[in-house]
């Protein structure tokens, strides 16, 4: 009685919301027919950013069908925090949860799915739906991976050298330059799980007037640039 | 392979109830939800409500509500639909649908009974 | 309760020529990102088939010349290309909290 294998569609909310919401459910035409009696463990990665709302979705089984609904919660040096609704007494029970944002859509009874009001880092981690039927489990995994945008900087720190950063990111941007130069890129580790890029490069061809930093990151692509003039210029700054 | 066997064509009279079965076999029998739906000569499908043998759970369509009554008989892994004060207009072919877990679709029927109401 | 309203009521298609037919629900049968939408096949003397589920899945053993689409409260299934023993009534029907079918939609092949 397991979840056929399956292939998933995230969904974004219009831009013009005041917090933007994502949810991570079926893209329908991609479930497989194998309806395997092998209990099977179906795991997503799912990227987030930072500071939307997250709904998480269980396999897609009527109510009348299950026993009980369990959403386990991991999350990176917490006790495993674990949701439950038991159909036959109409009650909810929480072990371990202490984070106040995440919380049920609404009454399981009604509805099963998971919502993560404002994603902070801290809700890097494992979410697991396990509905239990009177004939087996069916599991839906999450590997949410919280993403923070970062902070791009370019400016020109002396004759011909400019330096582009990108500060605070999750994961860590990648920096690549227009035209390539004689570059040097440092990474710094911050303990919340950013990470600041720093890219300086240097032109010795004279011919080169203008430069180009563009950052790569999940959460958007950013491009900077900037005129090498002989002496330090103007500082360049943005967000992605 | 899952099979569901239903019982023979009844024909009753006016007022009378009918007592319809539906054998299961080939899987666990109280695992899985049993619908009855029933269709009238030319009509479309409707469904009159299903019962859940592993807890005796049961939710009838409004339409059928006091005249219905849907059982299970876990030794013979059968489940019963009965509909009582029959008129002609209950004349119809009844089945019985197994729901499966993944997207609660039916993917096993009954091959249909069918109940003739006459005087 | 939800409604669903099947368009056309019957329809005629030569053999090799595409069918299409609608489902329209009364409100939205789109839960958690499933559609909770089904499409069976019924033949004469024969109860009904399961050939799509959850909207577009097509159900084990069932050819792929049938499709489905849609969601939220418009659904569509597509049988192309039409073969001769395609002639059957077909129903939607929504299954997720109480449970309805369309009105059911006749084929004929010409």
């Known amino acids: 009685a397991a979840q056929p294998n399956n292939s998933l569609m995230l969904q974004t909310s219009k831009e013009n919301h005041a917090l933007a919401s994502s949810s991570l459910c079926m893209d329908e035409k991609q479930i497989t027919q194998n309806y395997s009696k092998v209990l099977a463990e179906v795991n997503t990665s799912w990227p987030v950013k930072m500071a939307t709302n997250a709904v998480l979705c269980c396999p897609p089984i009527a109510l009348r069908n299950l026993i009980i609904i369990t959403w386990e919660i991991i999350l990176r040096g917490q006790p495993s925090c674990t949701k439950a609704y038991k159909k036959e007494t109409n009650e909810t029970k929480e072990t371990n949860c202490t984070d106040e944002r995440i919380t049920w859509v609404s009454r399981p009874d009604q509805n099963s799915d998971l919502q993560i009001r404002t994603v902070a880092i801290t809700h890097d981690g494992y979410y697991r739906c396990i509905m239990v039927t009177p004939d087996g489990n069916f599991h839906r995994g999450y590997h949410l991976q919280v993403l923070v945008t970062p902070e791009v900087t370019l400016f020109q720190n002396r004759n011909r050298t400019a330096v582009c950063k990108a500060v605070a990111g999750k994961p860590a941007a990648h920096i690549s330059w227009i035209p390539e130069g004689d570059c040097a890129t440092k990474q710094e580790y911050w303990s919340n799980g950013t990470v600041t890029v720093k890219s300086t490069c240097h032109w010795e061809v004279h011919n080169v007037s203008t430069v180009t930093c563009h950052v790569s990151h999940l959460t958007g692509n950013k491009s900077l640039y900037i005129e090498l003039l002989p002496v330090p210029g103007a500082k360049k700054s943005a967000k992605l | 392979q899952v099979q569901l066997v239903q019982s023979g064509a009844e024909v009753k009279k006016p007022g009378a109830s009918v007592k319809v079965s539906c054998k299961a076999s080939?899987?666990?029998?109280?695992?899985?939800?049993m619908h009855w739906v029933r269709q009238a000569p030319g009509q479309g499908l409707e469904w009159m409500g299903y019962?859940?043998?592993?807890?005796?759970?049961?939710n009838y369509n409004e339409k059928f509500k006091g005249r219905v009554t849907m059982t299970r008989d876990t030794s013979t892994s059968t489940v019963y639909m009965e509909l009582s004060s029959l008129r002609s207009e209950d004349t119809a072919v009844y089945y019985c649908?197994?729901?499966?877990?993944?997207?609660?679709?039916?993917?096993?029927w009954g091959q249909g009974t069918l109940v003739t109401v006459s005087s | 309760d939800i409604v669903l309203t099947q368009s056309p009521a019957s329809l005629a298609v030569s053999p090799g020529q595409r069918a299409t037919i609608t489902c329209r629900a009364s409100?939205?049968?789109?839960?958690?990102?499933?559609?909770?939408m089904h499409w069976y096949q019924q033949k004469p003397g024969q109860p009904p088939k399961l050939l799509i589920y959850?909207?577009?899945n097509l159900e084990s053993g069932v050819p792929a010349r049938f499709s489905g689409s849609g969601s939220g409260t418009d659904f569509t299934l597509t049988i192309n290309p039409v073969e001769a023993n395609d002639t059957a009534n077909y129903y939607c029907?929504?299954?997720?909290?109480?449970?309805?079918f369309g009105q059911g939609t006749k084929v004929e092949i010409k």
């Open positions: 649908a197994r729901e499966d877990y993944y997207g609660s679709r039916w993917g096993t």
């Open positions: 080939g899987y666990t029998f109280t695992s899985y939800v």
């Open positions: 019962i859940n043998p592993y807890n005796d759970d049961t």
């Open positions: 409100k939205s049968v789109s839960t958690s990102g499933y559609s909770y």
């Open positions: 959850l909207a577009s």
């Open positions: 029907q929504h299954s997720h909290e109480l449970l309805t």
